[in-house]
């Protein structure tokens, strides 16, 4: 119960983040105009991934696509990639992670199948979460280092009385969007990824059963060749023989649940 | 079409009050913001300030905070300039104009004659 | 505060005469966000209120005649009448719709000989 309640959540958790790293993608809002020690405009600028847009204070709104691929900055141009990766990276995870609820039944897909997909989603989820959170953290240093070159010289050809006020841009709603988002699907991975561990199917522990031929015991250990996780089922780092006989000598130890907390 | 309808003119005398309507028609009023302009005789034009349709928060410039009031009436897309304690100065041609695309004002009022005088 | 200043302050013409007035701005009125300059021009007739002709600097208002242009960048700008009509005959203001306050030009007083 626990288990499915893990990978229920994470699952949950995963969507919601992902669902915020498309929206943190698409939102205009990645640098917007600074306005604090700057003269009032009747014009808020503000910056996306993909277009920039200006709000006069009349309530009209332009904005303008970046029609170009060669012109843009290397910065912005990685930003897009690792967004874009996280995205497609979190879309596999969760359809891979729907088809590994515990919850949902496909035919007769075993246990260590959807402890294995759980696991996959798991990874795929840290993976897209860490390339947002990335990706956002990049762009957040790229408008730090431009905001204060451009604090340095912030009134430019001050010759006479003519003034040009430089427009400064401060971080915007969609990177506060990106991090959480990138946190959350990260979140999700990681408890994704222990879900997993509880999926792990578990040595059925049958009693020997002692067969005597020409005077030897012999204990026949069923179900040697149950599939392996890799998780819980050979954490004690035991010898398995594959479909092997063992003697009756042999002391058996079987991983019980509480070997997969 | 877009209309700016102004209440007509006005006799005051110094300390009194003064409230002048724009009635505006022709589009959805709460989509633009409305500004007040004023002309004195013989001088340029002087904004005033404006008022945010869609909330009713005004914004006065400086020379104008004090004794200038500006109001919405939203069901009878109505706004309103109240001038409180007149002064002799205040003797001029007041314009409400709406908001336009560019930060303009594209569409005026017909302007409000103001005379102050004792 | 954005100072104005328009130059000519009165220009007397004859009919179909090309015309050009000035506007500078103590400030640029260039916008970096989508690169338009946040200038206008209202053109207001005796007893009449002041009718939008050009914004962005350059931009017609509907239903303005073409014979009206407007130029420039940054702190200057000019209004070119490419054929006076007596219609025309009005007082031309340029406006800073820039930087709060939005602030005005003293006016150029268009005359006919």
């Known amino acids: 119960m626990a288990v499915t309640a893990c990978q229920g959540l994470g699952f949950v958790v995963s969507l919601i983040g992902i669902a915020g790293i498309i929206a943190a993608t698409c939102m205009d809002q990645w640098s917007t105009q600074d306005l604090y020690n700057n003269p009032v405009t009747a014009v808020f600028n503000y910056q996306g991934l993909w277009r920039s847009c200006v709000r006069e204070s009349s309530g009209f709104t332009e904005c303008r696509g970046y029609f170009t691929l060669l012109g843009l900055p290397a910065m912005l141009q990685a930003v897009r990639a690792l967004m874009i990766v996280g995205i497609v990276l979190g879309a596999i995870g969760l359809l891979v992670s729907i088809f590994a609820l515990k919850c949902i039944r496909i035919g007769s897909m075993e246990d260590s199948a959807k402890a294995n997909m759980t696991l996959t989603s798991g990874i795929m989820f840290i993976v897209s979460g860490l390339c947002a959170i990335a990706g956002v953290s990049v762009f957040a240093n790229m408008l730090v280092t431009n905001f204060w070159m451009s604090t340095a010289n912030m009134y430019t050809g001050m010759g006479g009385m003519v003034q040009t006020v430089q427009t400064r841009y401060t971080f915007g709603a969609a990177l506060f969007v990106g991090w959480v988002a990138g946190g959350l699907t990260l979140i999700g991975g990681v408890m994704m990824c222990i879900a997993c561990r509880g999926l792990a199917p578990e040595e059925t522990n049958y009693k020997a059963v002692s067969y005597h031929a020409s005077g030897h015991s012999v204990a026949y250990k069923p179900g040697g060749f149950k599939a392996s996780t890799g998780f819980g089922s050979n954490t004690k780092n035991k010898k398995i023989y594959d479909g092997g006989a063992r003697t009756e000598d042999e002391v058996q130890s079987y991983p019980s649940k509480h070997d997969y907390v | 079409q877009i209309q700016m309808v102004q209440s007509g003119p006005e006799l005051k005398k110094p300390g009194e009050t003064v409230r002048i309507s724009c009635k505006a028609s022709g589009y959805s009023f709460t989509t633009a913001g409305m500004q007040w302009v004023r002309k004195m005789p013989g001088e340029g034009l002087k904004w005033i300030g404006w008022?945010?349709?869609?909330?009713?928060?005004?914004k006065y410039t400086e020379d104008f905070k004090g004794r200038f009031a500006f109001s919405l009436e939203t069901s009878a897309s109505t706004t309103y300039l109240q001038i409180s304690n007149l002064k002799n100065e205040d003797t001029a041609t007041y314009f409400c104009a709406r908001w336009g695309k560019g930060n303009t004002m594209d569409y005026w009022g017909q302007g409000t004659s103001v005379i102050v005088s004792s | 505060d954005i100072v104005m200043t328009q130059s000519p302050s009165s220009l007397t013409v004859t009919a179909g005469e090309k015309v050009t007035m000035s506007c500078k701005s103590s400030q640029s009125l260039l916008n970096g966000g989508n690169q338009r300059n946040y200038l206008t021009w209202y053109q207001q007739k005796p007893g009449q209120p002041p009718k939008l002709l050009i914004y962005w600097a350059s931009t017609r208002e509907s239903g303005v005649p073409d014979r009206f242009t407007g130029s420039g960048s940054g702190t200057h700008f000019t209004l070119t009448i490419s054929s006076v009509q007596a219609e025309d005959l009005a007082v031309y203001y340029c406006?800073?719709?820039?930087?709060?306050?939005?602030?005005f030009g003293a006016g150029t007083k268009l005359e006919l000989k």
């Open positions: 008022i945010i349709a869609h909330s009713g928060e005004p």
């Open positions: 406006q800073n719709a820039y930087f709060f306050p939005l602030t």
